[in-house]
């Protein structure tokens, strides 16, 4: 089923951008907002 | 670019006691500063940050006890009811930035604080 | 509140060889983490940040890898200055309480 694990990667994904978000308001930024691939 | 912390002495259990850190060659609108502590013999032990918003945040065991401030150059931590437990070296450092690098993160060489009758 | 598992507490290695250093999250931090090495008498030195970037001056046998709540750090060709002890750090956002972190216990490593 992988629309199953490919919808838990991509909310997983979301989740990860919002606390990117959140500790940028707290660290600052360095350089305007880009997306790491691992 | 630097940070110093300094304040650290012998206090009797209950003395409030400010630690003050530092800075020098940055601005602290641009850094978050956190306070990190570390008893003799045992590990390192997170007690909070000021981000750049200036919003504070704390671990759950320092809450209520400890509190971070900041002026221009300075970021203070106020510590009350002390107790021989908090007996540590205190940790000044600087946060990497969000998107920023490895040179962002600054240590000081810590503060003594001793807690004893 | 964020909370960091360290294992092993302490490891022995021999010169060229290889170390490996666990630090399990009790949440998942994505690739929130940091690896530290301090020596007696220091501040921590930052080795690596975002679970696998490597701190600029640190040499490339220490390698960072992990995301979620498992991560690992991983020091091949062991040399006596690696003698040490390594800490974990993780960062977590929680909606209740906002920004947290927290070290593992640490884990000393002994060069023979």
């Known amino acids: 089923h992988s629309d199953g694990i490919f919808t838990d990667s991509y909310s997983r994904y979301r989740k990860q951008m919002a606390v990117k978000k959140y500790l940028a308001a707290v660290l600052g930024k360095r350089y305007k907002q880009r997306v790491k691939n691992k | 670019q630097s940070v110093e912390e300094s304040g650290g002495r012998l206090v009797t259990p209950g003395t409030p006691l400010t630690l003050t850190c530092t800075v020098s060659?940055?601005?602290?609108?641009?850094?978050?500063m956190s306070w990190v502590r570390q008893a003799p013999g045992k590990g390192l032990e997170w007690i909070g940050i000021m981000g750049v918003n200036d919003i504070t945040y704390y671990a759950s065991w320092a809450k209520g006890r400890f509190t971070i401030s900041k002026t221009s150059t300075t970021v203070d931590l106020k510590m009350t009811s002390l107790t021989t437990e908090d007996t540590a070296t205190y940790f000044c450092?600087?946060?990497?930035?969000?998107?920023?690098?490895?040179?962002?993160?600054?240590w000081g060489p810590g503060t003594l604080v001793t807690v004893s009758s | 509140a964020i909370k960091m598992t360290q294992t092993p507490s302490s490891v022995s290695a021999a010169v060229g060889g290889t170390v490996t250093i666990n630090c399990q999250a009790s949440?998942?931090?994505?690739?929130?983490l940091a690896w530290y090495q301090q020596k007696p008498g220091q501040p921590p030195n930052l080795l690596i940040y975002d679970a696998s970037d490597l701190a600029s001056g640190v040499p490339s046998r220490f390698s960072g890898s992990g995301d979620g709540t498992q991560f690992t750090l991983t020091i091949s060709a062991v040399q006596c200055e690696d003698a040490a002890t390594y800490y974990c750090?993780?960062?977590?956002?929680?909606?209740?309480?906002?920004?947290?972190?927290?070290f593992g216990g640490g884990t000393e490593v002994v060069v023979k």
């Open positions: 450092t600087r946060e990497i930035r969000d998107d920023g690098d490895s040179s962002d993160k600054l």
């Open positions: 750090q993780g960062v977590a956002w929680s909606s209740n309480t906002g920004y947290g972190s927290a």
């Open positions: 949440e998942d931090i994505y690739t929130n």
């Open positions: 060659g940055f601005s602290l609108n641009n850094y978050a």
